[in-house]
């Protein structure tokens, strides 16, 4: 059982492993994977991890490339956990409105919005 | 048929309407709505709009409060459109890896990650 690694450290390590194994991963020239056409990544986590699954099934395993896919699986687990927390707490309307206001505020300032 | 309004302008107007109608919206003292417990809003769009639906069904309609819910419905439509674009384009592995790297980079720098 691996020692618990903080998610932030896990993401950093995964970025490094992705860079290390890039040549191996792109070896399959004919493989096509769905790629989101916008940068609001959080909306596309399902498709991203489906793509990772496709890639894993087409990649020769062994060594640290296994570690890469293991990390990606742990990141998926973290995100699934976050999604579960979307509806956990039932609160008064004023609190829901404050969250909605924050959501729209972030959408207003940080999302990449195409007309 | 209303004139198309850019989504960014729609979000701004909705924020203003939300502020205007707050007192009316919070009048139901006993209503409880699920509130996400983290700031990664994009992961929770489904729950947020379910909450909006609950609120709309409990709110006396009329005047500009209808405009608020209409706007929120258009924002949902925009987000649903963005979600459809998550899996539309099938690309070569190197392009998928670029997107994955960007996704992890954003997760590394912008997400609020609790250990």
């Amino acid at each position: 059982i691996p020692t618990e690694i903080p998610t932030s450290a896990l993401v950093k390590e995964t970025l490094a492993l992705l860079s290390t194994h890039r040549t191996l991963l792109i070896a399959n020239e004919t493989l096509r994977i769905p790629v989101p056409v916008h940068k609001n990544h959080q909306l596309c986590t399902e498709e991203i991890f489906q793509g990772i699954g496709t890639l894993e099934s087409q990649t020769v395993q062994g060594g640290t490339v296994e570690r890469l896919f293991k990390n990606l699986s742990l990141i998926k687990k973290y995100i699934d956990g976050q999604k579960k927390k979307c509806g956990e707490e039932r609160r008064r309307v004023n609190q829901f409105l404050d969250y909605l206001q924050e959501f729209l505020g972030v959408m207003n300032t940080e999302w990449i919005i195409e007309s | 048929i209303p004139t198309e309004i850019p989504t960014s302008a729609l979000v701004k107007e909705t924020l203003a309407l939300l502020s205007t109608h707050r007192t009316l919206l919070i009048a139901n003292e006993t209503l409880r709505i699920p509130v996400p417990v983290h700031k990664n809003h994009q992961l929770c769009t489904e729950e947020i709009f379910q909450g909006i639906g609950t609120l709309e069904s409990q709110t006396v309609q009329g005047g500009t409060v209808e405009r608020l819910f209409k706007n929120l419905s258009l924002i949902k439509k925009y987000i649903d459109g963005q979600k459809k674009k998550c899996g539309e384009e099938r690309r070569r592995v190197n392009q998928f890896l670029d997107y994955l790297q960007e996704f992890l980079g954003v997760m590394n720098t912008e997400w609020i990650i609790e250990s």
Epitope: E89, Q95, E102 | R32, H38, K39
Partner: antibody, heavy 117, light 109 residues
Framework: QVQLQESGPGLVKPSQTLSLTCTVS??????????WSWIRQHPGKGLEWIGY???????YYNPSLKSRVTISVDTSKNQFSLKLSSVTAADTAVYYC?????????WGQGTLVTVSS | SYVLTQPPSVSVAPGQTARITCGGN??????VYWYQQKPGQAPVLVVH???DRPSGIPERFSGSNSGNTATLTISRVEVGDEADYSC???????????FGGGTKLTVLG
């Protein structure tokens, strides 16, 4: 289990500003399910709500104190703070910080602040 | 702004039933929360949403709310129940929290 701990000076001079900080452990202050609140209790009296803040920065204050109160949040330190300006002896009280969902779920142990010259 | 009125004190013998009231205009349309506070300690929630008990609170504690009065009832009162009890509501017109003045429960004995 969420834990809250108040910190700050126990003695403040009249006309000065009372400053307290509440450190939250066991949960992120960015938890959208909570407001973060300050309450005080004058010696031998009932509870008085001072105000609360959402992680986004939205604040709500008791109208009777509004002109003197500022509550702020520091998500990076998992803390929120209270500033009460132009204090008088009438502001002598035990000050509590608390997490506020639909009700006050978790409380700090309270800190006594005395206003005296 | 909204005002909650509680009696300053209530006395009861052990084993009897104590009733602590909290008055407010049309309080029956609001959710009421009750807190117990023992000397030198922070308050603890004993009843939420009018009549629901948090886990760990004895069944002897119950609540009701209608019209202009909410009531906290403590049956089979024990010496350890001696404390201050405060009611709380939200004033939805302003998003403000309102506390009652508190009631000191004395267990005679």
């Amino acid at each position: 289990q969420v834990q809250l701990q108040e910190s700050g000076p126990g003695l403040v001079k009249p006309s000065q500003t009372l400053s307290l900080t509440c450190t939250v452990s066991g949960d992120s202050i960015s938890n959208g399910g909570y407001y973060w609140s300050w309450i005080r209790q004058h010696p031998g009296k009932g509870l008085e709500w001072i105000g609360y803040i959402y992680y986004s920065g939205s604040t709500y204050y008791n109208p009777s104190l509004k002109s003197r109160v500022t509550i702020s949040v520091d998500t990076s330190k998992n803390q929120f703070s209270l500033k009460l300006s132009s204090v008088t002896a009438a502001d002598t009280a035990v000050y509590y910080c608390a997490s506020l969902g639909n009700w006050f779920d978790y409380w700090g142990q309270g800190t006594l602040v005395t206003v005296s010259s | 702004s909204y005002v909650l009125t509680q009696p300053p004190s209530v006395s009861v013998a052990p084993g009897q039933t104590a009733r602590i009231t909290c008055g407010g205009n049309n309080i029956g349309s609001k959710n009421v929360y009750w807190y117990q506070q023992k000397p030198g300690q922070a308050p603890v929630l004993v009843v939420h949403d009018d009549s629901d008990r948090p886990s760990g609170i004895p069944e002897r504690f119950s609540g009701s709310n209608s019209g202009n009065t909410a009531t906290l009832t403590i049956s089979r009162v024990e010496v350890g129940d001696e404390a201050d009890y405060s009611c709380q509501v939200w004033d939805s017109s302003s998003d403000h929290v309102v506390f009652g003045g508190g009631t000191k429960l004395t267990v005679l004995g």
